[in-house]
């Protein structure tokens, strides 16, 4: 189980001539919303076929009114992500349809009117748990820019969300044959319950003992890659028994890389090396060049030897990713020392230092007591980046400037009355108690638990606390 997430970045006129008219006007203000439909596999199904992987609808965007005479700008977008939960395994390959809808807010009878502005569709390969993938799609004169990813919901992990994680039973290691669950290294893979030998990479099960294959794999244990090459050729064999599935010697059989990409096997699957102008897991995404403005956040787009070749983005400080789309969390490197608070301002890092520390990275330990006098005979004590005064008797406060009220803490026990004295306090004890703080009961026979009172003092007389 997991969630497919879609983030719309912009929807507006595409480059080139024939800019579309704004969909909203002063007479008919409107707002946008989006619908996403997901289907497993790379099938080119009709838009109307069911969204077997799931569908989602965005919130409504802000109301927009066209400025008269202005070209249609990028239109205001709804907040937040579109999320499509999936219950089963993530298929790895999927088809998507993203529709942009207009909600007209004029005085229609029966409430707002909806109309479809644009529909884009595509087929992609995507591993769950990977980074955001960026995409640009055109629909007529409109252009939609978006990012998407698939992530697993705990306890599922892995590229297909089929491995399960459980908290460790032993603190140090996982049970026999079970691996730690990256990135949750404090958890372990749950014991396998699939059919013995079922490929952990390409197979999964929802019932004990079964082995169901991910898209692109076949065989009883999901170890045989599907080759579609014989299906694509009109002269190739076609068999009802195989359904054009030809067992191949490895994951590169039939070359899963499109557009002239070259395939190389990896320990887990395969990797495509794409020609210029193509990218994606199978080199299926094509033709984005610097002319499409693919570098975000002020990245410098540099093309190859000709204008139609692929591009690279040189990112400004604070951004990374192939399109400079990711903000670098420079505070994650914990540059601020001595407990300073890190602030990433985009153009620069700032450290907000704790008291007693200074410098761009809070690296200087200030002499806490330097120039800090404690009044009334108090002494300065350094520690923890802040100075503290140990005050003489009768004084208190941060700098010992305040005359202490020795009676404030009610120091006299058993109902004794407290009197402030120039050198401290005096407790006048209630009948039956004695001691500097009236803490000792006087025994009924007149003897106390203490040695006898000094000569000239009766039990119960005020005792001065020195």
């Amino acid at each position: 189980a997991g969630v497919f997430e879609l983030q719309i970045h912009s929807f507006g006129p595409g480059p080139g001539p024939g800019a579309p008219r704004s969909p909203c006007s002063a007479r008919l203000p409107c707002r946008l919303f989006f619908r996403v439909c997901l289907k497993p596999g790379l099938s080119e199904e009709a838009a109307e076929s069911p969204c077997a992987l799931g569908a989602a609808l965005s919130a409504r965007g802000p109301v927009y009114t066209e400025q008269p005479g202005a070209p249609a700008p990028d239109l205001p977008l709804p907040d937040g992500l579109l999320q499509v939960p999936f219950r089963d395994a993530w298929p790895g390959t999927f088809s998507f349809i993203i529709e942009t809808w207009r909600e007209e807010l004029g005085d229609q009878i029966g409430g707002p009117a909806w109309s479809l502005l644009a529909r884009v569709a595509g087929r992609r390969r995507l591993a769950a748990g990977g980074p955001w993938a960026r995409d640009i799609q055109r629909a007529g004169a409109w252009e939609l820019r978006f990012s998407y990813r698939a992530r697993c919901e705990p306890p599922a992990v892995g590229t297909a969300c089929t491995r399960l994680c459980r908290p460790r039973s032993a603190p140090s290691r996982c049970g026999p044959g079970l691996r730690p669950c990256a990135p949750l290294e404090d958890e372990c893979e749950a014991p396998l319950v699939c059919r013995a030998g079922c490929s952990p990479e390409h197979g999964f099960c929802e019932q004990p003992g079964e082995c169901r294959c991910l898209e692109g794999w076949t065989g009883p244990l999901c170890t045989v890659p599907v080759s579609t090459s014989s299906c694509l050729s009109p002269r190739g064999p076609s068999s009802a028994t195989t359904g054009c599935l030809v067992p191949g010697p490895g994951p590169c059989d039939g070359n899963p890389c499109a557009n002239g990409g070259s395939c190389s096997e990896t320990p887990r699957s395969f990797e495509c090396t794409c020609p210029r102008g193509f990218y994606g897991l199978r080199c299926e995404v094509s033709g984005v060049t610097c002319a499409d403005g693919p570098c975000f956040n002020g990245g410098l787009c540099v093309g190859g030897a000709d204008p139609d070749s692929a591009y690279i983005c040189h990112c400004p400080p604070g951004f990374q990713g192939s399109n400079c789309e990711k903000r670098v969390d420079r505070c994650s490197l914990q540059p601020c020392r001595n407990g300073g608070l890190c602030l990433d301002l985009g153009h620069a890092l700032r450290c907000r230092c704790r008291a007693g520390f200074a410098g761009p990275r809070c690296e200087h330990d200030l002499d806490d007591c330097a120039g800090r006098a404690c009044a009334n005979g108090g002494t300065c004590v350094e520690g923890g980046g802040a100075h503290r005064c140990s005050c003489a008797l009768g004084f208190g406060g941060r700098d010992c400037r305040e005359r202490a009220d020795p009676c404030a803490a009610r120091p006299c026990a058993h109902g004794g009355r407290c009197y402030a004295h120039f050198s401290g306090l005096v407790c006048a004890c209630a009948p039956g108690y004695m001691g500097a703080r009236c803490e000792f009961p006087v025994h009924p026979d007149g003897a106390s638990a203490l040695p006898a009172a000094p000569p000239g003092l009766r039990p119960g007389d005020p005792q001065r606390y020195l």
């Epitope: 820019r145 610097c290 787009c301 540099v302 204008p307 040189h314």
Partner: antibody
């Protein structure tokens, strides 16, 4: 305020070398890409080279490629242009300029330093 | 080779009148990620370095008076001074960024004088 001050210009013979410097102040130099742009006497502007903020990426105009080297020392807030195998046609006022990420343009310029290549 | 051609080469306009300078590129000017074109305009007064006026074809740089405006897309761009002032006498340059290989290219300049 942002200030860029070039130095190192002068008269030099063809084939010889010269090193220009540009000292930056008033902004975080280590966050900014920097350019050299030149202007021959009475002529228009010609882009010479760019160096990215971290010094790892450098590009040059065709007319100086292989002869000029752009570099920077972020600890000294200084940009350099090492000019080798100088030619008469390299005679110009050389400006350093700050790269504007948003507009891919030059948002601040120094006053320039004159390089004269003459035999 | 990519080229930028400005027209006219020089322009004499009365004080308070409109001045218009055109800039034509031999190829489409590249856009940024918001599809605004990487085309800038600079003003250079005698004995001074150039000063950025307009970037992304139509965005005024900070401190630039609003009598300066930029427009255009694709290959054709325009700088307009709506009401020429004496201090606007200068040479104006358009500049674009080209990506393959990367280079920043200037037009030949347009000299604006008072008629």
């Amino acid at each position: 305020q942002v200030q860029l001050v070039e130095s190192g210009g002068g008269v030099v013979q063809p084939g010889r070398s010269l090193r220009l410097s540009c000292v930056a102040s008033g902004f975080t130099f280590s966050n900014c890409g920097m350019h050299w742009v030149r202007q021959a006497p009475g002529k228009g502007l010609e882009w010479v080279a760019i160096i990215w903020y971290d010094g790892n990426i450098k590009y040059y105009g065709d007319s100086v490629k292989g002869r000029f080297t752009i570099s920077r020392d972020n600890s000294k807030n200084t940009l350099y242009l090492q000019m080798n195998s100088l030619r008469v046609e390299d005679t110009a006022v050389y400006y350093c300029g700050r790269h504007d990420y948003g507009g891919n343009s030059f948002d601040y310029w120094g006053q320039g330093t004159l390089v004269t290549v003459s035999s | 080779d990519i080229g930028m051609t400005q027209s006219p080469d020089s322009l004499a306009v009365s004080l308070g009148e409109r001045a218009t300078i055109n800039c034509k590129s031999s190829q489409n000017v590249l856009p940024n990620s918001n599809k605004k074109h990487y085309l800038s305009w600079y003003q250079q007064k005698p004995g001074q370095p150039p000063k950025l006026l307009i970037y992304l074809a139509s965005t005024r740089a900070s401190g630039v008076p609003d009598r300066f405006s930029g427009s255009g897309s694709g290959t054709d761009f325009t700088l307009t001074i709506s009401s020429l002032q004496a201090e606007d006498v200068a040479v104006y340059y358009c500049q674009q960024y080209y990506s393959s290989p990367p280079e920043w290219t200037f037009g030949q300049g347009t000299k604006v004088e008072i008629k």
